[in-house]
Interface confidence: low
Amino acid sequence: KESCDVQLYIKRQSYHSIFAGDPFKLECPVKYCAHRPQVTWCKLNGTTCVKLEGRHTSWKQEKNLSFFILHFEPVLPSDNGSYRCSANFLSAIIESHSTTLYVTDVKSASERPSKDEMASRPWLLYS
């Protein structure tokens, strides 16, 4: 029987390589059965995850999943780091794995790679 608990589908060691100055949407895939939970984003600072207050967030509803989106408008160099979403469900807190944003500061990059090159060379992870 399929669980009716809330599930957050951010995989361990997931990452996004992005550029400062670009818009970016960080998605937290959420699965729930009846009532949509309250979901929040936080940014890891050492061992604590600091809740992101007053940020532009939105929901996107799909057939099989919903997505709680954190908007970066635009991405700043200081957005580099690891993020986690958490859902408040039946008075319990369910936390996702963390996902990491690797921000390249265009000002310090000698030449900006193409999107295709970036997609094929997310070199900042595992390097």
Epitope: E2, S3, D5, Q7, L8, Y9, K11, R12, Q13, S14, H16, E27, P29, K31, E62, K63, N64, L65, A119
Partner: antibody, heavy 120, light 108 residues
Framework: QVQLQESGPGLVKPSETLSLTCTVS????????WSWIRQPPGKGLEWIGY???????NYNPSLKSRITISVDTSKNQFSLKLSSVTAADTAVYYC??????????????WGQGTLVTVSS | EIVMTQSPATLSLSPGERATLSCRAS???????LSWYQQKPGQAPRLLIY???TRATGIPARFSGSGSGTDFTLTISSLQPEDFAVYYC?????????FGGGTKVEIK
Amino acid sequence: QVQLQESGPGLVKPSETLSLTCTVSGGSISSYYWSWIRQPPGKGLEWIGYIYYSGSTNYNPSLKSRITISVDTSKNQFSLKLSSVTAADTAVYYCARVILYSSGWSFDYWGQGTLVTVSS
Amino acid sequence: EIVMTQSPATLSLSPGERATLSCRASQSVSSSYLSWYQQKPGQAPRLLIYGASTRATGIPARFSGSGSGTDFTLTISSLQPEDFAVYYCQQDYNLPLTFGGGTKVEIK
């Protein structure tokens, strides 16, 4: 019934780029994650990477510098490009759909696979 | 990355016998992140078990999965002729997703 079909050249020369496309029929590519997996002749399975229909990707770090996975929702297709191939890239390449369960992922629908040989 | 090790590499059994296949992870993957697949020659893998113990749609009850942490088992209670194949375990606790090297179940 969802069906996946890989297509692309069966022979690629060393140092060139391998390009494969997976066409999804019997269902929409939207709202799912999709993956590429390969299997060298007589060996085990290796996960290459995945893409969500919105374009979000994650790649196997052992191949990351050479992979691009892209999606074309208008054609219900997603594609794999693997650059600078060598004989070690000779394998049957499978495309597969990810099923989400509890807090995990599995591959519930697979293409029949296409053998790509790297040889001059 | 998490390395998945399957044993034995080959299992020689007769139809009607019980098959026990082992999969060991190099680190704990919990019980929610382990799947089993069956692959016959010239065919794509077929999902049998997910979440370590839940049978996929259409999979007969003779297939069962168990285990948690680092040690997992696929059991085929009574081997049928169509069950002779290669079986793979797969973890998705961490990226990259990784598969075991496979166990071949052959007719004795």
